[in-house]
């Protein structure tokens, strides 16, 4: 069961490194995507700038220190940052008062560069992906992650925060990203509705029926918002999700505990679990470039790790994913996802040949882009 | 200062119950996890039950599925475990322990209290 | 018997260095679960050592440290000292078993 252009073992050319939800931010169609059926209508992006405060709920965690005793550092429960800006994107105003990346929306007004200038910056996300057009950079090495396999106690928070569904991760989650070090905060989803598919990033042009992104915050950096504008400083894995003949497991995890939490602003606990689990095995084999969150505050300089393998889950639990949860304005939580941006001469990097058989429709040749870590 | 106080331990014949209680203090019990690990005589460490943080989850392991009962009243500060249709093999000291490390650590023990179960 | 093993014992005179290995299987250890480690002294609880595999609680001295391979992991004691004799204890979770797992622990004798 693979969509056009990625199947689970085939390249996907998905985003890169990135943290597309970290502050919740919400993406707004750009000019390089032109609206399509299910594009939520976006916001045009004005130039502007990109630390404000983050999107989705990312917490405002401290890298943890092995002096510092563990239960006060791992067992309380993990802040979120303020704002709560990681929401999936909804049809409706937020209630909430405050800040005023808390008042946005998918598709309609505000428009987001309003809410947050940096929305209108020139290096946003998502973006679509065109394998065959990517850089084949050797030295990209295959992912690394530590600790993402939680024991079922502690239980974990899990919200629906008017944009999206967020999964709170504990501290000690590492993920090495070439030299550097990231801490996972946050995971989250984006989706469509029936019969449309929800992801943020495309490949060639492909939506996916949605797509998991998992929040981090470089090792260089204390807090979120330190970190938020600068390069580097937040880092997104994201994988597609698409549709399988079996029930994902590890989803099920969490897909099953969605009606408790069908209200917005509503969340419970769940038992921990392998986070890596949600992910696609093969962690070699990815697209990575630098982008933006994808909500407001959409802050740039943020790492997009997107891999090329997707993951299955069933029809049934696909359909439990998109139909389930409630936003603001008593409208669906649906199609949560910002359109796609326009690259302005960036190179999207990939771990592998990507541009060689990549996909099912592969073109006459096309001259590569040269990897900028070439040699490294 | 964190602690946990444990009490209820004692001599009881075999297929006989006892309920052992753990107050906590010093740290909000209401947001962790808790165990009970107990330790035969001269023998190793061995888990017994956990509670999730909100009581709504219990996890025991197979040797005493069925017959001890694990709880907590987070308006008390106490953790719980009810012991039925106790075995010689029960025998031991029983500890109290916080769970709440998300790496899956014990933080907090209780100082321990003694279960004899003969005839 | 323990999923996880460890050495029954071991000993050191003061001032040296030992180690304590654990090793398990692909279900605990092998699939990315932390491994902790406990020092119970004779007559009290188990106290927190190492968490995380490499972690040190505040006030647990620089001397012992953790590490974590493959299957196994190891905790390493520097600078032996006479109160450092006490049972030592390897921890993790199973995720076939579904238990919280402890080693069969190890006796540390600090010798003369």
């Known amino acids: 069961q693979r969509l056009p252009r990625m199947q689970e073992d085939s390249p996907l050319g998905g985003g890169s490194s990135g943290e597309d939800d970290p502050l919740g931010e919400e993406d707004l169609p750009s000019e390089e995507d032109s609206p399509r059926e299910e594009d939520p209508p976006g916001e045009e992006d004005l130039p502007g700038e990109e630390d404000l405060p983050g999107e989705e709920d990312l917490p405002e965690v401290k890298p943890k220190s092995e002096e510092e005793g563990s239960l006060k550092l791992e067992d309380l429960p993990t802040v979120e940052a303020p704002g709560d800006p990681q929401e999936p994107q909804n049809n409706a105003h937020r209630d909430k008062e405050g800040d005023d990346q808390s008042h946005w929306r998918y598709g309609g007004d505000p428009p987001w560069p309003r809410v947050s200038p940096a929305c209108a910056g020139r290096f946003q996300s998502p973006v679509d992906i065109r394998p065959q057009l990517a850089a084949f950079c050797p030295a990209l090495r295959p992912l690394e992650l530590l600790g993402f396999q939680l024991p079922p106690l502690p239980e974990l928070r899990l919200r629906n925060n008017g944009h999206s569904v967020q999964l709170t991760l504990p501290p000690g989650l590492e993920m090495a990203l070439g030299p550097g070090r990231e801490y996972a905060l946050q995971l989250h989803l984006h989706w469509g509705a029936a019969g449309r598919p929800g992801s943020e990033h495309t490949v060639e042009g492909h939506r996916f029926p949605a797509e998991i992104h998992v929040v981090h915050l470089s090792t260089a950096f204390a807090r979120v918002d330190e970190a938020l504008g600068r390069p580097g400083g937040l880092a997104v894995l994201a994988a597609f999700l698409e549709e399988g003949p079996e029930e994902n497991s590890a989803y099920e995890q969490l897909l099953s505990r969605l009606e408790e939490i069908a209200e917005e602003g509503s969340e419970t606990q769940v038992p921990g679990l392998d986070i890596s689990a949600l992910l696609p095995s093969d962690f070699s084999r990815y697209f990575q470039y630098e982008g933006s969150l994808t909500t407001p505050p959409c802050a740039q300089g943020v790492i997009w790790t997107v891999f090329n393998q997707t993951v299955m889950l069933s029809a049934k639990q696909l359909h439990t994913l998109s139909d389930t949860l409630w936003g603001p304005g008593d409208s669906r939580l649906q199609l949560n996802f910002r359109a796609t941006q326009p690259l302005n001469g960036r190179v999207i990097e990939a771990s592998f040949p990507a541009g060689v058989d990549s996909s099912p429709r592969a073109a006459e040749p096309v001259q590569l882009n040269s990897c900028l870590a070439a040699g490294d | 200062q964190v602690q946990l106080v444990q009490s209820g331990g004692g001599l009881v014949q075999p297929g006989g119950s006892l309920r052992l209680s753990c107050a906590a203090s010093?740290?909000?019990?209401?947001?962790?996890?808790m165990s009970w690990v107990r330790q035969a005589p001269g023998k190793g460490l061995e888990w017994v039950s956990a509670?999730?943080?909100?009581?709504?989850?219990?996890y025991y392991a197979d040797s005493v599925k069925g017959r001890f009962t694990i709880s907590r009243d987070n308006s008390k500060n106490t953790l719980y475990l009810q012991m039925n249709s106790l075995r010689a093999e029960d025998t031991a000291v029983y500890y109290c322990?916080?769970?709440?490390?998300?790496?899956?650590?014990?933080?907090?023990w209780g100082q321990g209290t003694m279960v004899t179960v003969s005839s | 018997q323990s999923v996880l093993t460890q050495p029954p014992s071991v000993s050191g005179a003061p001032g040296q260095r030992v180690t304590i290995s654990c090793t398990g299987s692909?279900?605990?250890?092998?699939?990315?679960?932390?491994v902790h480690w406990y020092q119970q002294l004779p007559g009290t609880a188990p106290k927190l050592l190492i968490y995380?595999?490499?972690n040190r609680p505040s006030g647990v001295p620089d001397r012992f440290s953790g590490s974590k391979s493959g299957t196994s992991a190891s905790l390493a004691i520097i600078g032996l000292q006479a109160d450092d004799e006490a049972d030592y204890y390897c921890?993790?979770?199973?995720?076939?078993?579904?238990?919280?797992?402890f080693g069969g622990g190890t006796k540390l004798t600090v010798l003369g």
């Open positions: 995380g595999n490499t």
């Open positions: 509670i999730s943080a909100n009581g709504g989850t219990t």
């Open positions: 692909s279900s605990n250890i092998g699939a990315g679960y932390d």
């Open positions: 010093g740290f909000p019990f209401s947001s962790y996890a």
């Open positions: 921890q993790s979770y199973d995720s076939t078993l579904r238990v919280w797992m």
């Open positions: 322990a916080n769970n709440g490390n998300y790496r899956g650590a014990f933080d907090i």
